[in-house]
Interface confidence: low
């Protein structure tokens, strides 16, 4: 059973409360909502720095570029762009900075064009696992989307939940193989730490995966095998210490990648040596001149592509009789 | 079928308490937001109180604010309520609601209500 719904004009926080507003009649084709700008010609509808609390309902349906940016929606509820007739040329979604703390399950359902979505800098601490595939089921209908950009999502250390903010994201990104038709997927400046090591086995079709100014400190356990679209691949930013034997001969196997691994604290010790023949031989790295280490202290700047064997030695481990306090 | 069942209205004295709960079934429950409405006689449905899908993120009627705690458990498929320094215009019909879908289609369940009556 439904009720009516009722005014939320008591309610205050700091990211307002969101109740979906009812749309008695579907909008007339030329109609713009309040606080937008459309133009018809260009397909394009931009309601930027608003302050809006909710969707417009009124969205005109030629609409394909869609900007809501710079607004304070707070919560994305499921269905939040489902219209009668639905917006079925909607391509390219943009929300970012819209202050998100919540999207929830099936929240981008009922847009069958849609294929590019940006979510960046938002502080998404509660990203609902179907939030992309709109269903709980083991396998999902596809979805459209191509592009998805979620770039610095992270919320504030204090308003995160007791679980893993990598988990998150990945769970909704793997939820019911619906991505399997990404191309682009960007997550940097997100404070990730480690990178779950199912995730990229599950989109096969990436062919851009942005990592940077994460707080990446190994990709030992990730496997780039299947990636054979992959195009580039970007980890500038991280806390990358070695690229090991394993990871060096997947990303040599891909045909088409670029690597970009600027700005890593490279630990230049005997466990480096691998890294630094490969990279000599290389052409897979952009500005592979430009990596230095970074550590221990007497290797620090010293760039990669000059280290020989030599250089690249680990101090002996002392046993407890011999060391020195 | 979705189905929602609250339970633990009653009458009860200025400045006490009750504890609310609403036991869902027939959906997904740990991918949806909650919520607790009210309504009091010759009144308009207002919202009291709303929980994201993990419990993270809650929010409140300024009416309510620091008297009123909502919280939920996945593994119970359970919203509650806690009521505390319960005041007379506290005095109403309490539902649990669901939103599963855009409200325009539809698609937001509700149970049946608990009377929470305050009353010297």
């Known amino acids: 059973s439904s009720s009516p719904t009722s005014s939320a004009s008591s309610f205050s926080s700091s990211a307002p409360f969101l109740a979906s507003a009812v749309s008695a009649q579907p909008p007339l084709p030329d109609q713009c909502p309040a606080l937008c700008e459309c133009s018809e010609a260009a397909r394009t509808v931009k309601c930027v720095n608003r302050n809006l609390t909710e969707v417009p309902t009124d969205l005109p349906a030629y609409v394909r570029n869609l900007f809501l940016t710079g607004n304070q929606l707070a919560v994305l509820p499921a269905g939040a762009f489902a219209r009668r007739p639905p917006l079925a040329e909607l391509a390219a979604l943009n929300l970012s900075g819209s202050r998100l703390d919540e999207v929830r399950a099936g929240a981008f359902e009922h847009l069958p064009s849609l294929r590019q979505l940006d979510l960046s800098h938002n502080p998404l601490a509660d990203l609902s696992p179907f939030a992309f595939s709109g269903s709980n089921a083991s396998v999902s209908a596809p979805s459209p989307l191509v592009e998805l950009i979620l770039n610095h999502i992270v919320p504030p250390e204090d308003e995160r939940q007791n679980r893993s903010f990598e988990g998150m994201v990945v769970a909704a990104l793997l939820a019911g193989r619906a991505l399997q038709g990404l191309r682009r997927l960007e997550l940097a400046s997100n404070h990730f730490l480690y990178l779950p090591r199912d995730v990229l086995a599950q989109l096969p079709s990436l062919r851009h995966l942005d990592l940077s100014n994460n707080s990446l400190v190994s990709l030992t356990y990730v496997s780039f095998r299947n990636l054979t679209h992959l195009e580039s691949l970007h980890l500038e930013d991280n806390a990358l210490k070695v690229l090991h034997n394993g990871t060096l001969a997947e990303l040599q196997g891909l045909p088409h990648i670029r690597v970009f691994l600027d700005n890593n604290p490279w630990v230049c010790d005997c466990h480096m040596a691998d890294m630094v023949t490969w990279l000599k031989e290389t052409e897979v790295v952009q500005g592979k001149d430009r990596l230095t280490c970074a550590y221990p202290e007497k290797m620090r700047n010293r760039v990669l592509l000059e280290l020989n064997s030599a250089d690249l030695d680990c101090d002996p481990i002392l046993p407890p009789s011999l060391q020195t306090s | 079928q979705v189905q929602l069942v609250e339970s633990g209205g009653g009458l009860v004295q200025p400045g006490g308490s009750l504890r609310l709960s609403c036991a869902a079934s027939?959906?997904?429950?740990?991918?949806?937001?909650m919520s607790w409405y009210r309504q009091a006689p010759g009144e308009e449905r207002e919202l009291v109180a709303s929980?994201?899908?993990?419990?993270?993120?809650?929010r409140y009627a300024d009416s309510v604010k620091g008297r009123f705690t909502i919280s939920r458990d996945n593994a119970k498929n359970t919203v509650y309520l806690q009521m505390n320094s319960l005041k007379p215009e506290d005095t109403a019909v309490y539902y649990c609601?669901?939103?599963?879908?855009?409200?325009?289609?539809?698609?937001?369940?509700w149970g049946e209500g608990t009377l929470v009556t305050v009353s010297a």
């Open positions: 609601n669901a939103e599963l879908g855009p409200r325009r289609l539809g698609m937001d369940y």
């Open positions: 027939g959906f997904t429950f740990s991918s949806y937001a």
């Open positions: 929980i994201t899908t993990a419990g993270g993120s809650t």
